[in-house]
Amino acid sequence: ESGYAQNGDLEDAELDDYSFSCYSQLEVNGSQHSLTCAFEDPDVNTTNLEFEICGALVEVKCLNFRKLQEIYFIETKKFLLIGKSNICVKVGEKSLTCKKIDLTTIVKPEAPFDLSVIYREGANDFVVTFNTSHLQKKYVKVLMHDVAYRQEKDENKWTHVNLSSTKLTLLQRKLQPAAMYEIKVRSIPDHYFKGFWSEWSPSYYFRTPEINNSSGEMD
């Protein structure tokens, strides 16, 4: 085809499994969006492989991804965010595998941050608060958050609470006294946009008071 790339030597390219997955992050760097793709098989030889996205872009028909170690990504303002794009793995001009994807359906929010827990003695509860950069965004504003907490000694016994706000109250009586707890939070798009859970926030650790013997309540 006129003007297009010359293809290199395909060798055994057809024998490999080039399945891949991608996620988008909108307004991740000011008004810039990002798209990150990676092969599902970590052993794929990526030496001469490139990713390309075509369609649902502004200004250009297609864009090449940048490769960084084993991931491929684009950071740009030029995603139209309407309709589907075609993302292909290429060797030269030959497409090895392609996926038609609407970038608004593979959104991975940024991880929540500034997670903290404050004990209210009078109310006998713990107020959990955290922040999210998405409150300031134009596109992915509405999120569902998953707060997970566990007693530190219980390796895999997490309790999960889903909420749409950035504040949660945990009742003291629901927690073990004089125990160390770990808590963390992640987010997922919850309105119009679809996609994946964010990374977990850094964990926050807090200790519950001991039981006050006279009242039967925790200190």
């Epitope: 490139e50 502004v58 200004e59 250009v60 297609c62 864009l63 090449n64 991804f65 940048r66 030029k78």
Partner: antibody, heavy 122, light 107 residues
Framework: QVQLVESGGGLVKPGGSLRLSCAVS????????MAWVRQAPGKGLEWVAT????????YYPDSVKGRFTISRDDAKNSLYLQMNSLRAEDTAVYYC???????????????WGQGTLVTVSS | EIVMTQSPATLSVSPGERATLSCRTS??????LAWYQQKPGQAPRLLVY???SLHIGIPARFSGSGSGTEYTLTISSLQSEDFAVYFC?????????FGGGTKVEIK
Amino acid sequence: QVQLVESGGGLVKPGGSLRLSCAVSGFTLSDYYMAWVRQAPGKGLEWVATISASGLRTYYPDSVKGRFTISRDDAKNSLYLQMNSLRAEDTAVYYCARPMSAHYGFNYFDYWGQGTLVTVSS
Amino acid sequence: EIVMTQSPATLSVSPGERATLSCRTSEDIYNGLAWYQQKPGQAPRLLVYSANSLHIGIPARFSGSGSGTEYTLTISSLQSEDFAVYFCQQYYDYPLAFGGGTKVEIK
């Protein structure tokens, strides 16, 4: 600052070959797509070739496809244009050009070399 | 292949006047358009990209506009240093293409 310096131009007979070089400085060559653009005497600009930042993909118009080859050596901070089977209509000033935007393929050019003249004549 | 048509080929304008240069494309290029200025013996100089974004260091008297297949470069008040040849370029798709150029000359 960013600099692009072309060399290798000259007089060549029809059917002959020439290799142009572009020495770059002031930026990381491996971050950028690079291109060659030519201008025949008294005429407009014509895009000749583009190479992707990785060097894995090359793009040409029909007028030079199969005759010209763009390549790069990032370690030497150099871009090349190998021109074979030259014709009289290839006579032009050849410019090396760098896109403003790194990495992805937005091909508008904010830095240009001073150009090198290629004359194809018997 | 996208064909670029610039008009007029020559534009005679007095200093201080407004100049309007046109660039038409054979198909929608979704704002993937740049404008360049070229003076004799010099390489082209980027003025505008994304159809309407002014390149750094370019005077505010230059402006780009348009969408779809119709684009315009406007010089609001021509200065002596603005008399030159102007080219539009589409970068929406390969093969990249330049217009034939508009020569802005002193009236």
